[in-house]
């Protein structure tokens, strides 16, 4: 004989478990229905009645089958420096990503706790490793025969142009200057321009000014080349 199909709520077999999309209610001691994503348990089940589900209110969500009494609140709106890559719906939380030119410096379970601006390599330095959604740019000094005359988070060190007659030799931050005859560019592996990295989930605010120095010291830190601009925590 085929096994009987049990309808919720029902008492599980001794040592047995509830089926998929069901949960065991300790109070009723019954297997009861979970609520689908986008809903929550408005009324819990009893021995004779199943779970009553209701839709999540605005700005709240549930992403999984559940029996929570209240839907989860969506995260706060993305700041003006962020891009909303996933809107808040009844079934999913809002996701904010670091804007282009920024990376996630400190991640959290859902998204990013702290965004920071990608490092810009100064003249004489080129990008050794491009930034990614979760890592900063790594700069390196331009090796002999190469140069970078830009402040950039994407430019690598480029080879000096090869002159028939050199007017001014190149250095790490300046290309060679040739006399009027047309120069040739030495071959360099890879492109000069690296693409901007894809952003990641994030929360950040406007870059903060450089902090002041430690107590009891007479000098403060430089105003010049700004160390990393970072956002505040997004919690």
């Amino acid at each position: 004989l085929p096994a009987q199909v049990a309808f919720t709520p029902y008492a599980p077999e001794p040592g047995g478990t509830c089926r998929l999309r069901e949960y065991y209610d300790q109070t009723a001691q019954m297997c009861c229905s979970k609520c689908p994503p986008g809903q929550h348990a408005k009324v819990f089940c009893t021995k004779t009645s199943d779970t009553v589900c209701d839709s999540c209110e605005d700005s709240t969500y549930t992403q999984l089958w559940n029996w929570v009494p209240e839907c989860l609140s969506c995260g706060s709106r993305c700041s003006s420096d962020q891009v909303e890559t996933q809107a808040c719906t009844r079934e999913q939380n809002r996701i904010c990503t670091c804007r282009p030119g920024w990376y996630c410096a400190l991640s959290k379970q859902e998204g990013c706790r702290l965004c920071a601006q990608l490092r810009k390599c100064r003249p004489g330095f080129g990008v050794a490793r491009p930034g990614t959604e979760t890592s900063d740019v790594v700069c390196k000094p331009c090796a002999p025969g190469t140069f970078s005359n830009t402040t950039s988070s994407t430019d690598i060190c480029r080879p000096h142009q090869i002159c028939h007659v050199v007017a001014i030799p190149g250095n790490a931050s300046m290309d060679a200057v040739c006399t009027s005859t047309s120069p040739t560019r030495s071959m360099a592996p890879g492109a000069v321009h690296l693409p901007q990295p894809v952003s990641t989930r994030s929360q950040h605010t406007q870059p903060t000014p450089a902090p002041s120095t430690a107590p009891g010291t007479s000098f403060l830190l430089p105003v010049g080349p700004s160390p990393p601009a970072e956002g505040s925590t997004g919690d």
Epitope: A105, L106, R122, R129, D136, V137, C139, K140, P225
Partner: antibody, heavy 121, light 107 residues
Framework: EVQLQESGGGLVQPGGSLNLSCAAS????????LSWVRQTPEKRLEWVAY????????YYSDTVKGRFTISRDNAKNTLYLQMSSLKSEDTAMYYC??????????????WGQGTTVTVSS | EIVMTQSPASLSLSVGETVTITCRTS??????LPWYQQKQGKSPQLLVY???KLAEGVPSRFSGSESGTQYSLKINSLQSEDFGTYYC?????????FGGGTKLEIK
């Protein structure tokens, strides 16, 4: 206010090991590159090791390469220096320093108070 | 490695005098040079960066200059709080070496 507090220094025999820590506060730790710098009893300064903000890039001075390891825990706002095969020449005051933001802002802008390491039998 | 030759190693001067400390590099470092001041029993402190730029809050009597591979730190009209040891450093290729220091004592 930015603070860097070193700990873990002490007296160790040649060939021994020591682990230094640096607890940081007052700034967004995970966005800054950090270094260890030491000062010998003769007052000479020597850069020891560097780690970038994400912990991806590390550089070492030739005198400690293969013996010392720099690391960081961005969740704990802590910088570390594991020192092994210690020599008498490693005797120094060890400073935890913020910087350089290498390739962009090339300087050490904050220094801790230092922790003393003495290697002697 | 890049050698930083700092001079003089020490000097004694009076309040009000002017002093110039120099640092010569064994190869070009493209202005990637900070100067630090260290007072007795204290940690070093940033004074100048990029060879010529004063750190915020540093008095204008301090100035940095460069000429080729020679870098200089000048202090006009020395004040009592200026006495201590001064170090140059480079941030070109690793290892990032320091000069030997200049101990500035009060006469």
């Amino acid at each position: 206010e930015v603070q860097l507090q070193e700990s873990g220094g002490g007296l160790v025999q040649p060939g021994g090991s020591l682990n230094l820590s640096c607890a940081a506060s007052g700034f967004a730790f995970s966005t800054y590159d950090l270094s260890w710098v030491r000062q010998t009893p003769e007052k000479r300064l020597e850069w020891v090791a560097y780690i970038n903000n994400g912990g991806i890039s590390t550089y070492y001075s030739d005198t400690v390469k293969g013996r010392f390891t720099i690391s960081r825990d961005n969740a704990k706002n802590t910088l570390y220096l594991q020192m092994s095969s210690l020599k008498s020449e490693d005797t120094a005051m060890y400073y935890c320093v913020r910087g350089p933001f290498y390739g962009s802002a090339n300087y050490f802008d904050y220094w801790g108070q230092g922790t003393t390491v003495t290697v002697s039998s | 490695e890049i050698v930083m030759t700092q001079s003089p190693a020490s000097l004694s001067l009076s309040v009000g005098e002017t002093v110039t400390i120099t640092c010569r590099t064994s190869e070009s470092i493209y202005s990637n040079l900070p100067w630090y001041q260290q007072k007795q029993g204290k940690s070093p402190q940033l004074l100048v960066y990029d060879a010529t730029k004063l750190a915020e809050g540093v008095p204008s009597r301090f100035s940095g200059s460069e000429s080729g591979t020679q870098y200089s730190l000048k202090i006009n009209s020395l004040q009592s709080e200026d006495f201590g040891t001064y170090y140059c450093q480079h941030f070109w290729v690793t290892p990032w070496t320091f000069g030997g220091g200049t101990k500035l004592e009060i006469k």
